[in-house]
């Protein structure tokens, strides 16, 4: 507890103080008082700098004194041998003795009393801005007339704040203008106009005289304008140093006038008015503004329309124009919206073709689709070149937005067939010579791939098994090879309606309309070992003449084996139908005359014993296209024969082209249309 006075005595006083002692006293008097500490007795072992024994007086962090030795009073009327006066209300006294004393020392006796301090004069920093009044235990500040004491109870200022100006036009001046403004004041004026109007401040140079800046350029008195996050100033000096017209871009303006204790001048006077908030005529690329004006202000509305090939993207929706309003804050609404080049996006991929990754997918960019050559070509033309159009679609000059379609190239083997030695009497072949060749394992037979989804074969091949398993792409039909080849799964078998179904197929003598189509579940991927054969055209160019050569292929019976391990092939000439009729049927199941011969059949063979045989059924009789010598078409399908190694009969495919096309169209997937 603070006390007004007190006594401090060394240990054992007035007896000798003990060795090795350290004792401290914390003196505290009430706030507003200083401390007068005086010693009436001092008998402490003397040493240099009082290093051995001492009494130390500390005020805050400052050592006020350190005493040792003997002292006596200089004044016969006063017992005081040493005294200290501090203007603070706290003091610490520390007594220390070392381990030995050469003589007997009695220590010290000291007293303290609280003394008044004059806050108005005793300190370097004057506590009051104007008038300071001291009293015992404290002080108070007071102000001259028309000034008031601030809440800090130290500073005086004039009452110049709190004015709010809401009129669209007005005048504001510093206090007492043009007489000198009050010192040590902070005047705040607020201008608050309705939203959409900006405060415009105008000053005349001669209407401004404020104490000039110091040598460092800092204003001692200053005028500052604050509009939102923008600040104009501080301004000071003789004559207004800032722009005479200040467009604040805000409907709210705070004017702050700050003065110090010295150097009053006449001050300042300004006028203000409210302008409708202007919005800048922004440069929005690739667009047109409607209406076009030199200046836009609050509440003006414009329509911004993008040029062709540009669009406004907002979320996921693209638009070609948008409206923008000049807002109360001087900013355009929808200012984030921009006319960007239309982005056609990553082009769609196409089956059996590709499109190079475009450098850009923006308006005007060009891409090129290509088909996987040489196995596919672009069916619907257009060259494959597409550009990114203004509507955001990839567009081709011919097809428009329709994608190109890559369809299999037909009738072109990767490697031409060459007869190596003299199917019966045929040669070894490679599947690359006959990439359209399809292998049926039950019954053991053949077929011809005519497009991605369809296999052409003989009706008698599929009449007993409507779910045949087929393979493509293998020269050998050994199990290990078939396991590596492509297995085709049928979706449906279509037998020609003219094919007569029998109770006992083995006794068949009528092979008219021996043709069937197998629709596949999945499309076949074309390549060097798998690719379709063409169908004949309907023109007379595709009418076969006797002697025209065709190729047959298959894994049917050979001279040596019932079934060929590897694909065999032969080149045969077309023969008159009578040649086939003349051959005696090897194992007749009926009378020779019972066998039916029709114009739907082609007779071929009879040369060097080359012929198709059991197990080759359904395979194509491939003839060179008369209009494109690089291609082969299926002129016939291996159907039946009187005797292997002589002449064989083949279904005349040309007579069935309409049925084939109709069947495929009626049973195609939507993607094929």
């Amino acid at each position: 507890e603070p006390t007004m006075y007190g006594e401090i005595l060394s240990p054992n006083y007035p007896q000798a103080y003990p060795s090795e002692v350290e004792k401290s006293w914390d003196i505290e008097v009430p706030e507003g008082y200083g401390i007068h500490l005086y010693f009436t007795h001092l008998d402490i072992e003397l040493s240099e700098n009082c290093a051995y024994d001492s009494v130390q007086i500390i005020s805050g962090d400052t050592e006020e004194g350190r005493l040792c030795g003997q002292r006596s009073s200089n004044n016969p009327h006063s017992p005081i041998v040493e005294e200290f006066q501090v203007p603070y209300n706290k003091l610490q006294v520390i007594f220390k003795s070392d381990f030995s004393n050469e003589e007997r020392f009695t220590g010290f006796a000291a007293y303290y009393v609280a003394t008044d301090i004059n806050e108005c004069t005793d300190f370097v920093d004057v506590p009051c801005s104007h008038f300071c009044n001291n009293f015992i235990g404290g002080y108070f500040c007071s102000c001259p007339p028309e000034y008031f004491l601030h809440d800090d109870m130290k500073n005086c200022g004039v009452n110049c704040s709190g004015d709010v100006f809401t009129a669209l036009i007005g005048e504001i001046a510093s206090p007492n203008y043009p007489k000198p403004y009050p010192e040590n004041s902070r005047c705040e004026y607020q201008i608050r106009l309705e939203k959409g109007f900006q405060v415009v401040v105008t000053l005349r140079r001669e209407d401004f005289d404020v104490e000039a800046a110091d040598s460092a350029g800092n204003c001692l008195d200053s005028l500052v304008f604050v509009a939102g996050d923008r600040q104009f100033g501080p301004y000071c000096g003789h004559g207004f140093p800032g722009p005479l017209n200040i467009e604040t871009k805000s409907n709210a303006l705070d004017i702050i006038f700050q003065t110090d204790l010295t150097g009053q001048k006449k001050g300042w006077k300004l006028r203000y008015h409210g302008d409708p908030m202007p919005c800048p005529k922004e440069d929005t690329p690739n667009s047109v503004w409607e209406p076009a004006k030199a200046k836009y202000v609050f509440r003006d509305v414009v329509q911004i329309t993008c040029l062709d090939g540009f669009e406004v993207v907002e979320g996921r929706v693209g638009a070609t124009s948008f409206y923008s309003t000049c807002q109360s804050n001087g900013k355009w609404s929808n200012s984030k919206l921009k006319c960007q080049p239309v982005d056609c996006g990553i082009p769609e991929s196409i089956e059996n073709g590709k499109v190079e990754d475009p450098e850009s997918t923006l308006f005007g960019s060009v891409i090129r689709y290509t088909c996987e050559e040489p196995y596919y070509y672009m069916e619907n033309g257009g060259g494959g070149e597409y550009h990114c159009a203004g509507n955001g679609s990839w567009v081709n000059e011919v097809l428009g937005p329709e994608l190109p379609k890559c369809v299999p190239v037909c009738g072109v083997p990767r490697e031409p067939f060459e007869e190596k030695q003299r199917i019966i009497g045929g040669s070894d072949a490679d599947i690359k010579n006959f990439p359209w060749q399809v292998f049926f394992d039950n019954p053991w037979a053949g077929g011809a791939l005519i497009n991605e989804y369809w296999v052409l074969t003989a009706a008698h091949v599929v009449e007993g098994n409507r779910e045949p398993t087929m393979y493509v792409g293998s020269t050998s039909v050994q199990t290990s090879r078939l396991a590596k080849s492509k297995m085709l799964t049928p979706e449906h078998v279509f037998i020609h309606p003219g094919w007569k179904l029998l109770e006992v197929p083995e006794g068949r003598t009528n092979f008219d309309n021996d043709i069937a189509l197998v629709r596949l579940k999945d499309p076949v991927k074309m390549g060097p070992t798998v690719s379709p054969i063409c169908l004949p055209g309907t023109s007379s160019d595709y009418n076969l003449m006797d002697g025209d050569l065709g190729l047959i292929s298959g894994w049917g019976r050979t001279e040596k084996r019932d079934r060929a391990v590897r694909l065999k092939a032969a080149r045969l000439p077309v023969a008159p139908l009578r040649k086939c009729k003349e051959v005696k049927v090897e194992k007749p199941t009926a009378d020779a005359e019972a066998y039916v011969f029709t114009p739907n059949m082609i007779c071929a063979g009879g040369e060097k014993g080359m012929d198709s045989c059991k197990g080759d059924s359904g395979g194509a009789f491939a003839v060179q296209d008369p209009n494109d010598k690089t291609k082969f078409y299926a002129a016939g399908l291996v159907s039946w024969g009187p005797q292997c190694g002589t002449y064989g009969l083949y279904t005349r495919v040309k007579n069935y082209v309409d049925w084939i096309m109709k069947t495929m169209q009626e049973n195609s997937t939507p993607r094929e249309d």
Epitope: D441, S480, A483, R561, V565
Partner: antibody, heavy 119, light 107 residues
Framework: QVQLVQSGAEVKKPGASVKVSCKVS????????MHWVRQAPGKGLEWMGT????????IYAQKFQGRVTMTEDTSTDTAYMELSSLRSEDTAVYYC????????????WGQGTLVTVSS | DIQMTQSPSTLSASVGDRVTITCRAS??????LAWYQQKPGKAPKLLIY???SLESGVPSRFSGSGSGTEFTLTISSLQPDDFATYYC?????????FGQGTKVEIK
């Protein structure tokens, strides 16, 4: 009709080699793919390897890699299988088998050759 | 390599019983599976190929089913001649591998 005739039974010491032959009749070796299968007494069937004429390479089961060699002499239509570094667990009947067509794994089997490995 | 696991290893049954043997592949082999019958001292005989195709000359009481990794051989009515060991074999890719065999014995 294809027939496969194998060489006779053999008794070999551990570490030795054995060469089993298989003569084809009724067809030519060039038209066929010859496989070799073995069966230890009272145990299951084990595929050893084959010559793949399409690829022109011999494919050996991983288990026998480095120890087995399969060769063919097309002039005599004879296939051979040689197994080296014999151990007692190689005691088995060794079959030569022709690969089938159209999904059938094996068409024709030889009569089998018993190889006994014993010290 | 593709592992083939047959179950059961041994099966006791009587004449006239319906018998089912299963074969599991360690990975998909599509339908490339065959079943064999072997009698002591004889070479194996092909019964079924391509999972469900019956080899010519094999009695119709034998049937096969399955694709991918799960396959079954069924003997609809066991005959005295059917007591033997049965093997499955995958021919999807080299190495061609056999199951360990299932012995069908008289109960």
């Amino acid at each position: 009709q294809v027939q496969l005739v194998q060489s006779g039974a053999e008794v070999k010491k551990p570490g030795a080699s054995v060469k089993v032959s298989c003569k084809v009749s009724g067809d030519t070796l060039t038209e066929l793919s010859m496989h070799w299968v073995r069966q230890a007494p009272g145990k299951g069937l084990e595929w050893m390897g084959t010559f793949d004429p399409e690829e022109g390479e011999t494919i050996y089961a991983q288990k026998f890699q480095g120890r087995v060699t399969m060769t063919e002499d097309t002039s005599t239509d004879t296939a051979y299988m040689e197994l080296s570094s014999l151990r007692s667990e190689d005691t088995a009947v060794y079959y030569c088998v022709t690969e089938g067509l159209g999904g059938r794994p094996f068409d024709h089997w030889g009569q089998g050759t018993l190889v006994t490995v014993s010290s | 390599d593709i592992q083939m696991t047959q179950s059961p290893s041994t099966l006791s049954a009587s004449v006239g019983d319906r018998v089912t043997i299963t074969c599991r592949a360690s990975q998909s082999i599509s339908s490339w599976l065959a079943w064999y019958q072997q009698k002591p001292g004889k070479a194996p005989k092909l019964l079924i190929y391509k999972a469900s195709s019956l080899e010519s000359g094999v009695p119709s009481r034998f049937s096969g089913s399955g694709s991918g990794t799960e396959f079954t051989l069924t003997i609809s009515s066991l005959q005295p001649d059917d007591f033997a060991t049965y093997y499955c074999q995958q021919v999807n890719s080299y190495d061609w591998t056999f199951g360990q065999g299932t012995k069908v014995e008289i109960k």
